[in-house]
Structures are given as structure tokens and as C-alpha cells.
């Protein structure tokens, strides 16, 4: 039975040219996290973090995606095209698969604030 929940940073905004941390957290379960996949709005792969093999960063993003902190992902040199949904997929044992969603808005404004409160989707 899947008892866990994914908490995410929810809806966040960040400045064009800046960076943002995408973070999900699995709680309320003792399941072992074996792999976390990070995907972009069009479901294209950004990165994989395998518990035993480490990180795989999609090659086209390697110059502006940094692994971590933890199981999260840091997206750098943001462009307006980065606006959209991001998904974390947690493969766990024995529970199975959990999925979280984050919406990132990249703002032109120099006063853009990076809001990053955790929330349950």
C-alpha cells in the first residue's frame, strides 16, 4: 500500500538569467528511494538520480543543470522558455512510483522573487 506523499516547492518564480532549485520530498513512508527522475513540461528528461549509480544529466542540459541539493535539481541561466511544469518521479521499494509537480514561472522583471515554500500538490 502506498502511504507516502510527495511534497514539492509548488509554484515558484525566478528571474531570467538566474537559477532556481527544483525540490521534491517524499514523506510518510519508510519506502527506499531507488531512483528519482526529473522531467520538463513536455515530459522530456532533464535528469535521473539513481541511488546506486549516481546522476545522469540529459546531455543538452549538462551546461546549465546542476545535480542537487540532495535529490533536487538546480536549473541555471534561466530563459523564458523554462517557464512551465516540472515533474519529479520517485521510484521506491516496496511502494512503487510517486510523482510530484512544480510550476516554474521565469520573469523578466528584476524584482522577481523566488518563492519556494513546500506544499503538497
Amino acid at each position: 500500500m502506498m502511504t507516502g506523499t510527495i511534497e514539492t516547492t509548488g509554484n515558484i518564480s525566478a528571474k531570467k538569467g538566474g537559477s532556481v532549485i527544483l525540490q521534491c520530498h517524499l514523506s510518510s513512508t519508510m519506502a527506499q528511494v531507488t531512483q528519482v527522475n526529473w522531467e520538463q513540461h513536455d515530459h522530456s528528461l532533464l535528469a535521473i538520480r539513481n541511488a546506486e549509480l549516481g546522476w545522469h544529466i540529459y546531455p543538452a542540459f549538462k551546461d546549465r543543470v546542476a545535480p542537487g541539493p540532495g535529490l533536487g535539481l538546480t536549473l541555471q541561466s534561466l530563459t523564458m522558455n523554462d517557464t512551465g511544469e516540472y515533474f519529479c518521479t520517485y521510484h521506491t521499494y516496496p511502494d512503487g512510483t510517486y510523482r510530484g509537480r512544480i510550476f516554474l514561472e521565469v520573469l523578466e522583471s528584476s524584482v522577481a522573487e523566488h518563492s519556494a515554500r513546500f506544499q503538497i500538490p
Partner: antibody
Amino acid sequence: EVQLVQSGAEVKKPGASVKVSCKASGYTFTNYYMHWVRQAPGQGLEWMGRIDPDSGGSKYNEKFKSRVTITVDKLSSTAYMELSSLRSEDTAVYYCAREGHYGFYSDYWGQGTTVTVSS
Amino acid sequence: DIQMTQSPSSLSASVGDRVTITCRVSENIYSYLAWYQQKPGKSPKLLVYNAKTLAEGVPSRFSGSGSGTDFTLTISSLQPEDFATYYCQHHYGNPLTFGPGTKVDIK
């Protein structure tokens, strides 16, 4: 065109070390992880480890962990695999293989380097 | 370690035949499975990754299916250049492991 060109065949004595090179071209070397896989004569494939050429960080198969070292030279776009304390059962073809776009599989392979361990 | 078994270990077939190779895995690997083709004296060639995605340049007569612990590689109409050994590999944990191979030869 992606190419992985490996160094030539080696004959080594038991207890010695061997260092195999793999020169990459046709793509951005630091953007793709590199794996090493070996194949004993008439046998299947055995994964040895992988490296991130950008950071130099590596992961190894526990079976080889104490004997294998995978390194890179970013300037020459070359990956290296060194295996120490060689024994006769290390006689095999050693392959470098580039990691694929979408995970930990390998999409391009070198031509292989035959390592023979014999007294 | 994740254990991989393949069946059959070898098969004889004719040009035009439909060929199916099975790979069974000791634990759930979701869809993280690749298939490779290897000809004698040559390096392995990637055919399929993520269980069903055809690698670039691979003919459409090849197809992969399955998830969890049971996977299949199908060649819809065997061609002369398809006689080779086929290996499955999980790409989900350390160590990455390969199946023992299935040799496809001419009947």
C-alpha cells in the same frame, strides 16, 4: 560522427596492471558519461564502471572496485580504464561505451581492446 | 545484484521469420531495459532502450516491449544481417548487468 577509438592489444603478466585508453570525437566529451564493459572469450558482457568526464566522478561495479580506476583527460577527450593485480581470468576484450541520452545504457561503443594475461 | 536470464539461449531461423527473444529480470526494473546486437568480432550495437524505444538508425522490424520483470525483443521479419547474438541489459542499478545472450543463427 561519434567515434570512440581505443588503444591497441596488450599482453600482460599476472600481477601487472594495464591501462586502456578511449579517445572520443564527434561530440562534446564532457556532456556524456562514459562506461567500461568487458567480455571474456566466448562469454557475455560485464559492466565495470562509469565516469562523468565533466566532474571526474565515477561509480564502479563492486566486483572490480579495489582493482579498477576510471579517469579522463578533458583536454584530449580521452577516457582511461586501469585494471591492476591482473590474473588469467581478466583476459578479455575491454570496451568503452558512451552513455545514452536518456539513462544508464550505452549508445556508442569503441572497437574494443584485447587484453591477454599470461605468464 | 539484479539477475538477468534470456530465453532461448540460441535459436535457428530462416530469413523472413518472426523471432521473439525473452528477457526475465529478478526484480522490478520498471522500463529500464536495453537490447544490444553483437556480431562475431564486433562491438555491441544498441537496438532498444527504455524497453521499447528504438535507437537511432535501427530498422523498424525490431521492437521491444515489457515492463517490470518480463521483456521481449521481436524481429518481425528476419533479415540476413540480423544473424547475431542479442543481449538484454538493465539500466537501473549498480552493477548494470547483462543477460547471457541469445544466439540467432541460420536454419
